[in-house]
Interface confidence: low
């Protein structure tokens, strides 16, 4: 079952999954000036059997040289639905990508892919948050969000993280990045 909405947004933080549950879809997005090949799949799908999980389909981008290359490639309507985003930059080394049963690893990059990956997560998925460069976590401890099914509706749990600026005036310095100490604290609703 797909999660109905995006993982919570946290100001000055990005999220990433260590592994992706079977059923997760990743849009085949291309960077500016490129588009998905006509015959190409609109998404990759994490599938598997009891012993192995892998991504079905391959994303392929081709030059859109004849087109107006100043426009971002617009996803098809079905791709826009329930967009799940995660920043590619600041890739988080949250854990070695250990093979988890029923999970796929981070898909390898494809040529000319977009800088932002758009995932469609499924119930039971966990994503992990980390402050972007120049910001530090106010509280220790891992910050994670889990997509859960409650009373027939999906929801993401609130991650325990607030990122404070190291250089912004009026902000106090943060602390060292969390190292999975047990007493992490909260999250933020953030401006959207």
């Amino acid at each position: 079952e797909l999660c109905d909405d995006d993982p919570p947004k946290i100001t000055h933080a990005t999220f990433k999954a260590v592994a992706y549950k079977e059923g997760t879809m990743l849009n085949c997005e291309c960077k500016r000036g490129f588009r998905r090949i006509k015959s190409g799949s609109p998404y990759m799908l994490c599938t598997g059997n009891s012993s192995h999980s892998s991504w079905d389909n391959q994303c392929q981008c081709t030059s859109s040289a004849a087109r107006n290359t100043t426009k971002q490639v617009t996803p098809q309507p079905e791709e826009q639905k329930e967009r799940k985003t995660t920043e590619m930059q600041s890739q988080m080394q949250l854990a070695d990508q250990v093979s988890l049963p029923g999970h796929c690893r981070e898909p390898p990059p494809w040529e000319n892919e977009a800088t932002e990956r758009i995932y469609h997560f499924v119930v039971g998925q966990t994503v992990y948050y980390q402050c972007v460069q120049g910001y530090r976590a106010l509280h220790r401890g891992p910050a994670e969000s889990v997509c859960k099914m409650t009373h027939g509706k999906t929801r993401w749990t609130q991650p325990q993280l607030i990122c404070t600026g190291e250089t912004e005036p009026s902000q106090f310095p943060g602390e060292e990045e969390p190292q999975a100490s047990p007493d992490g604290l909260p999250e933020s609703e953030t401006s959207r």
Partner: antibody
Framework: QVQLVQSGAEVKKPGESLKISCKGS????????IGWVRQMPGKGLEWMGI????????RYSPSFQGQVTISADKSISTAYLQWSSLKASDTAMYYC???????????WGRGTMVTVSS | QSALTQPASVSASPGQSITISCTGT?????????VSWYQQLSGKPPKLILY???KRPSGISDRFSGSKSGNTASLTISGLQADDEADYYC??????????FGGGTQLTVLG
């Protein structure tokens, strides 16, 4: 039992120095922030600042920055609030409180009454 | 930083419901879900009754509920009881990495 035990009431003269304490017990005291809150007689709560005893990382309210010093000794699970030169306007009840898992102060000390009078 | 704005006092009879508002800015109440509420009985330290806008710590009656819209948070106490008479304070984490309290609201249970 999780608790914060604060030092006893103090009566001081203007210009004197003072250090009051707050000892945490019943939990991993180096893993939680401890905040200090002032309540002047008949008035509301004012957040003064906060410290992480594990490494003494400290933040202050702009209103109290430079007026007080917050410190901690993690070896004895104790946080401190101190003044180098008290004023009559420092007369108040001072509470320490633990910042719990959701940015709320979940455990409070009983308070230390500080009276500054000539 | 300015204190969050609360009504100085509210009063109601036992069994009734009351709502106390707490108005801040987009840098505190409006920025995060970190709004908490405290009850302070006369001569006692404050006691946490709600956190994350509307969550109750264990042992807190479900007569206490909270909500937030924009820069204003609200505490509602239903089925008022005589021992609810106390001062109530809201608090919010701020974008400056600090906390701020409301000025407090004195609740009187008529009776």
């Amino acid at each position: 039992q999780v608790q914060l035990v604060q030092s006893g009431a103090e009566v001081k003269k203007p210009g004197e120095s003072l250090k009051i304490s707050c000892k945490g017990s019943g939990y991993s005291s180096t893993s939680y922030w401890i905040g200090w809150v002032r309540q002047m007689p008949g008035k509301g709560l004012e957040w003064m600042g906060i410290i992480y005893p594990g490494d003494s990382d400290t933040r202050y309210s702009p209103s109290f920055q430079g007026q007080v010093t917050i410190s901690a000794d993690k070896s004895i699970s104790t946080a401190y609030l101190q003044w180098s030169s008290l004023k009559a306007s420092d007369t108040a009840m001072y509470y320490c409180a633990r910042l719990g898992s959701y940015y709320a102060f979940d455990i409070w000390g009983r308070g230390t009454m500080v009276t500054v009078s000539s | 930083q300015s204190a969050l704005t609360q009504p100085a006092s509210v009063s109601a009879s036992p069994g009734q419901s009351i709502t106390i508002s707490c108005t801040g800015t987009s840098s505190d109440v409006g920025a995060y879900i970190y709004v908490s509420w405290y009850q302070q009985l006369s001569g006692k330290p404050p006691k946490l009754i709600l956190y994350d806008v509307s969550k109750r710590p264990s042992g807190i009656s479900d007569r206490f509920s909270g909500s937030k819209s924009g820069n204003t948070a609200s505490l509602t106490i239903s089925g008022l009881q005589a021992d609810d008479e106390a001062d109530y304070y809201c608090s919010s984490y701020t974008r400056s990495s600090t906390w701020v309290f409301g000025g407090g609201t004195q609740l009187t249970v008529l009776g």
